[in-house]
Each structure stands twice: as C-alpha cells, then as structure tokens.
C-alpha cells in the first residue's frame, strides 16, 4: 500500500481488564465518510474484519468479538466490552469513500496483580553455605502485563550480587491470559540476618499510572553455630523455699544445642544431671533448701558433636528450718517461772518474735521469752515466729502450749436457765485445768464430753425438765487430781411468749430439742448472773 511508511503512530487507548474500551475512529471528514466504515483487528500482522458500519448502522462479523462490540457516539466510536489480555492489539477503522483511508488504535490492557504472597524457606538457611540459598519465594498472581519485582531486606532494596544475592523470576500465563509471577530470592546470609525482615514489592502499571503492592514482612530461620551457653534463673532476685523456680539453658546458636542441666553434688563434687521437662527447663516446685548449689549447663551440637559448658551459677534457695521451742510442752506450778527458747536455722539472718496466741500481742522480740510468777491466766498458747526481714513471706512459726497445774477452772460459777416443763434441755458446762479435767453431772441424762484443747473440756447434757429437776437445779462438777469445782445451773420456768426481742435481759439463747413429751420444738434461754468468771 503506497504511503504506508508515513503512517502516523497508532492512537493509544489504555483500559483495565474487564472494563469497556472505547475505540474512537479518528478519520476526518476529508478522509472518509464515517457512515461507511470497516473495523479490523490486527494480530500477528493479520487483519480480521470484525465490524461493519453501513449508513450509520453497525453489524458484528462472526468470530471472537461478535458479542462484545457495539456502536456509540453516532457511529464514530466502537465499544469493546469485557476486555481481556488477548484484546491487547491494534484495531483499525477503514473509511471506504471517497477513498480508502485507515486510522490505527493500539489497545493496551492492564490488570493489577493480587497481593503478593511471600513464603519463607521453612527449612532455614545455614550461615556457612558456599552459595546463595533460597530465602523466600514471592508470588504475584493474575497481573497484566508482567509486574516487576523488587526484594527488600530491612527496608532496603536488594540488588543482584555475584555469589551473594541472586533473584530468579519466572512467569506463567494463566488460561485467562493473565500472568502469575514467581520470584525466588537466594542469598548468602550471616548471623545478624536472624532478625532481618524480608519482603517483596510488585510494581505494575494501570491506566491511572504506576502502582506497587508490598507483601508482608518475614524473617527467615538462620542457622549458625553456638558459641556460648549460659543459665537463666526465674524469678530473679532472692529465692525462698516454696517458690516456683525455673532454671533454663540458653545458647546463642540456632538451632539451640541439646541441653542438659547438672548440679554439683556437695559431697562428691561431681556434676549430676538433673531431670528437665519437655522444654529442657528444670522446674523446682516447690523450691527447697536442698535445691541450693552450683548448677551448670552443657550444650551439645548434635551435628558436630561439639559440646559447650556454661559458667556455673550458684543458686541459693533461702529457707527457715522448722522452728523448735524448748521446752516443747511445758508444765509449771502456779507462781513458778518459765523460760521458753526458740531456735531455727536459716540461710539469712533471722528475727524472732514471741506472740500470745489468743490475742496476737507481741510479748518479746528475740528468741527467749521469760515468764515469771506464773498465774493460771498465763496458761495457753505462745507462738514463736522466726522470720527473715530481708525476704518478705519467709518465716516459720511454732506454737507452744503452756500448762499451769491447777484444779479445774469453771467457765461460770452459777447460771440461770429459762426452761419449759417437759422440754428436753441441752445444757453445757466448760472447765479447764491441768491435768485436763473430767466433768460429771448430778442428774441422770445423756452426757457427752468434748476436748476443746489439752487443758479444756466441754460437757453437754441432754435432760428432761421435770418438777423435781426444777426444784433441785443441775450441777456439773469438774475434777482432776489437783481438785474439783462445781457450776450450778438454776432452772426457771418461763412462758415462751415472754421471750421477745425487747426483753431486757442480756444473755444468748440456747436451743433445746423438743422431746416426745412436747408438741413442738422449744427454746430455752440461758442467762448468766452478773458475777465475774469463777476462778476455781
């Protein structure tokens, strides 16, 4: 065709995959009548008629474009819908009158790739490899045209470097005509790269301009030999008996070597291997003073069979031993003296305190408590507390009961009990003394004795209230080898209706169980007479 060499460059139309390309026929009125135009697609220099315009009416030719072409803009523009990568070619319109002229349009098609998918080499990379090893693979799917890949390490782009960095990219064409790009980064890494962040970036073009997508950042397992092994103890700081203590081996190599933890036997001075858990951690729970000693860790590289030993670490589990009080069960006559001595061992300086058990009152700061001119009130519990002031919570205590010889001491001398005839009354009587007294009652009934502590006893009596009992009252007698004492319970009849909350008496209620002689449960009130506690 004459004059073909002078043909102007085709007009460029850029469009994204799936959208509609508007192919505007650029013939001027002088070049041809737009009401009589043929449209061709050019592929590999072969033209194929795809559309005809006659008297302004369009008609698709049978073939791949048949369903996707339509006329717009009063016949000047051909619309191509559902653009695919295969549509990237030259389209031309040819006017027939007054003479045959052509207008060429270059259709460029674009498609952004999907987010790049990065996969790190799960096997990791040894630092001493002779040539670059596979670090990670980056895949960008379904882009068009082929995007460009750039690899980054710690935010800096990586360049090809002989024997150090090699980027190997390949692409495949999907049935859709889109490209999937695969890029493999190979590199020689050093120990410092164990924390390096790698990512890939896909650069691509759209009608709107240049764009890029970044993958997530990954770190690659870097394998390097162990140079140092050491022990770590948790918690840090002062340890005490009862704590949960973890001793673990650490190493600066990857993978870590096979660890074993040993403790020096204080007798033989030999290192004896300790049993660790599945994670190689020696858990001491609860820690005991016997766990104190010199620990060390051995790291064995199973590939090279090279063994490394940690610096030994001294572990001190602070303790307070069982507290011993002497005498352990003191018995004294009234008026005599008693010296209580408290002893304990500890890994730290100890402080001693003596407290009265019943009141919590601090009697002495120090290991020795001296009691003079003992009265019976001095009998009872004394507690020695041995503590380490520098370690909160590290203490042990021992309770000692001081027994003062004496006849029974009654909880009350006399007591008035309000009762109803025919009820079963539950009476109680308490006495203390050393030796521990026994209690008897002057009436028949069901009695049971309960030891409250080594010097105190409580007796309860279930008895039926009869007229005779109302007349005589009830006595309980406590006795031991040193004497006897009696408490009297006066029984007084009362109507249950008089037991109202606004009653002006001040003693508590004692519950009594109804016997077969009464129709319902009844309650009796025990009322103390206003006099001091009897002292025997």
């Amino acid at each position: 065709v004459p004059g073909e060499a002078e043909q102007p460059a085709p007009e460029l139309v850029e469009v994204e995959v799936g959208s509609t390309a508007l192919l505007k026929c650029g013939l001027s009125q002088s070049q041809g009548n737009l009401s009589h135009v043929d449209w061709f697609s050019v592929h590999k220099e072969k033209r194929t008629l795809i559309f005809r315009v006659r008297q302004g009416q369009g008609q698709s030719e049978p073939g791949e474009y048949e369903q996707r072409l339509s006329l717009q803009d009063r016949g000047a523009t051909l619309a191509l819908t559902q653009v695919t990568p295969q549509d990237e070619r030259i389209f031309l319109c040819q006017g027939k009158r007054p003479r045959s002229q052509e207008y060429r349009i270059q259709l460029r098609v674009y498609k952004a790739p999907e987010e790049p998918n990065i996969q790190v080499n799960p096997l990791g990379i040894p630092v001493n490899s002779k040539e670059p090893e596979e670090v990670a693979t980056c895949v960008g799917r379904n882009g068009y045209p082929i995007p460009q890949v750039i690899w980054y390490k710690n935010g800096r782009p990586l360049k090809e470097e002989k024997n150090r960095v090699h980027i190997q990219s390949s692409q495949t064409v999907e049935s859709s005509g889109l490209y999937t790009l695969q890029s493999i980064l190979k590199a020689q890494l050093v120990k410092e790269d164990k924390d390096a962040q790698f990512y890939c970036e896909l650069n691509y073009r759209l009608p709107s301009g240049n764009h890029m997508k970044e993958s997530r950042e990954v770190t690659v397992p870097v394998f390097y030999p162990t140079e140092k092994v050491w022990l770590e103890v948790e918690p840090v700081g002062m340890l005490k008996e009862g704590d949960r203590v973890e001793i673990r081996c650490l190493a600066d190599g990857n993978p870590p070597p096979h660890f074993s933890i040993s403790k020096q036997n204080p007798s033989t001075r030999e290192a004896e291997e300790e049993t660790t858990n599945d994670n190689g951690v020696l858990v001491l729970e609860p820690a005991r003073k016997e766990h104190s000693g010199r620990y060390e860790c051995q790291g064995l590289d199973l590939d090279t069979m090279i063994s490394l030993l940690s610096e030994p670490q001294e572990l001190l589990v602070n303790y307070v031993s069982d507290v011993r009080v002497s005498p352990a069960a003191p018995e004294r006559q009234e008026g005599s003296s008693l010296t209580l001595t408290c002893e304990a061992e500890s890994s730290q300086d100890l402080e001693f305190q003596w407290l009265r058990e019943e009141t919590g009152q601090v009697l002495e700061r120090g290991p020795v408590l001296q009691l003079h001119d003992l009265k019976r009130e001095a009998g009872g519990g004394y507690r020695c507390v041995a503590s380490v002031p520098s370690i909160p919570g590290l203490n042990r205590t021992q309770l000692v009961n001081v027994a003062i010889f004496g006849p029974p001491w009654m909880a009350f001398k006399e007591r008035k009990v309000w009762v109803k005839e025919n009820m079963v009354l539950n009476l109680s009587c308490e006495a203390s003394g050393h030796p521990r007294p026994t209690i008897s009652w002057n009436v028949n009934g069901t009695a049971s004795e309960q030891d409250q502590d080594p010097q105190r006893v409580l007796s309860t009596l279930n008895v039926l209230v009869t007229p005779e009992l109302l007349e005589t009252g009830v006595e309980c007698t406590a006795s031991n080898d040193l004497g006897k004492n009696t408490s009297i319970l006066f029984l007084e009849l009362v109507n249950l209706t008089t037991l109202t909350p606004d009653s002006n008496t001040t003693t508590g209620l004692s519950t009594s169980t109804a016997s077969p002689h009464t129709r319902a449960n009844s309650t009796s009130t025990e009322r103390k007479l206003p006099e001091p506690e009897s002292r025997g």
Epitope: A329, E331, N401, D453, P454, D481
Partner: antibody, heavy 118, light 111 residues
C-alpha cells in the same frame, strides 16, 4: 540428780502379799505423778496405777483394782504399792516412773523383781 | 481400752540404715493439735528410756537421729542413721485416757 529407786521385790508364794517401795529424790515429790509399770519376763510393758502425792488421788488399771493399793509418805518422799492375793501371772519386774500432766514417763527407776511361785 | 499395735514386731538392720517403726492406735489419741503418743527405748535388763513425747518432741539428751511423727491413730518413730547403741526394743505408749497402754514392742536387731 532426779532419781527413783524401787525396793521390796522378792519371791513370794501365791495368795500372799508384798509391799513395794519407790523412793524419790532430786525433785519436788508432790508436784509430779508417780506410776507403777510392770513387765513380765520376755513380755511388754503394762501400766498398773498412778498417784498424785500432792492430793493422794489414785487411779488403777481395772485389772488390778481391789488387789493393788497405792499409798505415799510425803515426809519420806516415798510411794508404796501394796499387792495382795498374788498370782503366778503377777511375776514381773515392777518399775516406778514419774510423769507430768501429759502422762509420759520421763524418769524411771531401775525396777524390782517380784516372783510369785510356790 | 485403746489397743496399740506396733509393726514390725522385729526388724534386722545395719549400722547407718534408716529405720521406721509404726504404731497404730485403735482410736484417735489426739486432741486439738496434741497427740498423746510417746516412744521408749529399752535395752535388756534395763528400765525403759523416754525418747519422744507427745508424738514428735525429742526428750532432752536424746540424739537428733530419733524423730517422731503422726497424729490421730497412726504414728511413726524414725531413726535416720542407725548407730550400734540403737539396737534395742522400742515401745509406743498412749496417754489419751485411762488405762494407759503400750504397744507390744519392736525388737531391733543387728543384721
């Protein structure tokens, strides 16, 4: 030093009586309990009775009630065990022992042998 | 009466051994933290000697290799490292109530 010394043992015919003595020294006699414990040859220990010299209160093992009697002489710091109607099975070493109010025996005499035999 | 059962009745051991003797009472001999159980050692031809009182307290002058433990009905006398002078018969005794009773004894012999 604290000491208990038994005496009065010997060979006696069945049905006869014997009085054992226990002399205390080195402690306040009336502040402690004195017990008798016996041990038949090759056998274990058996508690017999106790007395509190301060009040003269006594307790007996039911097994010996009626036949054995405890008494004391505070001026001599001595305790006595009167044994009547003796039987062959009463043959034993008789120990006196001291206790406080928790009834463990912290001081023992060396024992005196009683043999009941015809 | 409370019956005291000691086990074993006899035991052979060597110097340096750790030995444990147990005593079981037919009912509890403990009251509010106090256990009325005591241990004695007796050598042939001699009077018994108090070792442990109130279950776990070492009598003055008794070597610390002797220890006692337990509460309620089950009690243990332990000798941590047998010495030649420890070969003897051992008795437990309760004082929870009258009559006081002893175990039948455990004879500890040299192996």
């Amino acid at each position: 030093q604290v000491q208990l010394v038994e005496s009065g043992g010997g060979v006696v015919q069945p049905g006869r009586s014997l009085r054992l003595s226990c002399a205390a020294s080195g402690f306040t006699f009336s502040n402690y309990w004195i017990h008798w414990v016996r041990q038949a040859p090759g056998k274990g220990l058996e508690w017999v009775a106790r007395i509190y010299p301060g009040t003269d209160i006594t307790y007996y093992n039911e097994k010996f009630k009626g036949r054995f009697t405890l008494s004391r002489d505070n001026s001599k710091n001595t305790l006595y065990l009167q044994m009547n109607s003796l039987r062959a099975e009463d043959t034993a070493v008789y120990y006196c022992a001291r206790s406080g109010g928790y009834w463990y025996f912290d001081v023992w005499g060396a024992g005196t042998m009683v043999t009941v035999s015809s | 009466d409370i019956v005291m059962t000691q086990s074993p009745s006899s035991l052979s051991a060597s110097v340096g051994d750790r030995v444990t003797i147990t005593c079981r009472a037919s009912k509890s001999v403990s009251i509010s933290g106090y256990s009325y159980m005591h241990w004695y050692q007796q050598k042939p031809g001699k009077a018994p000697k108090l070792l442990i009182y109130l279950a776990s307290n070492l009598e003055s002058g008794v070597p610390s290799r002797f220890s006692g433990s337990g509460s309620g009905t089950d009690f243990t006398l332990t000798i941590s490292s047998l010495q030649p002078e420890d070969f003897a018969t051992y008795y437990c005794q309760h004082s929870r109530e009258l009559p006081y009773t002893f175990g039948q004894g455990t004879k500890l012999e040299i192996k």
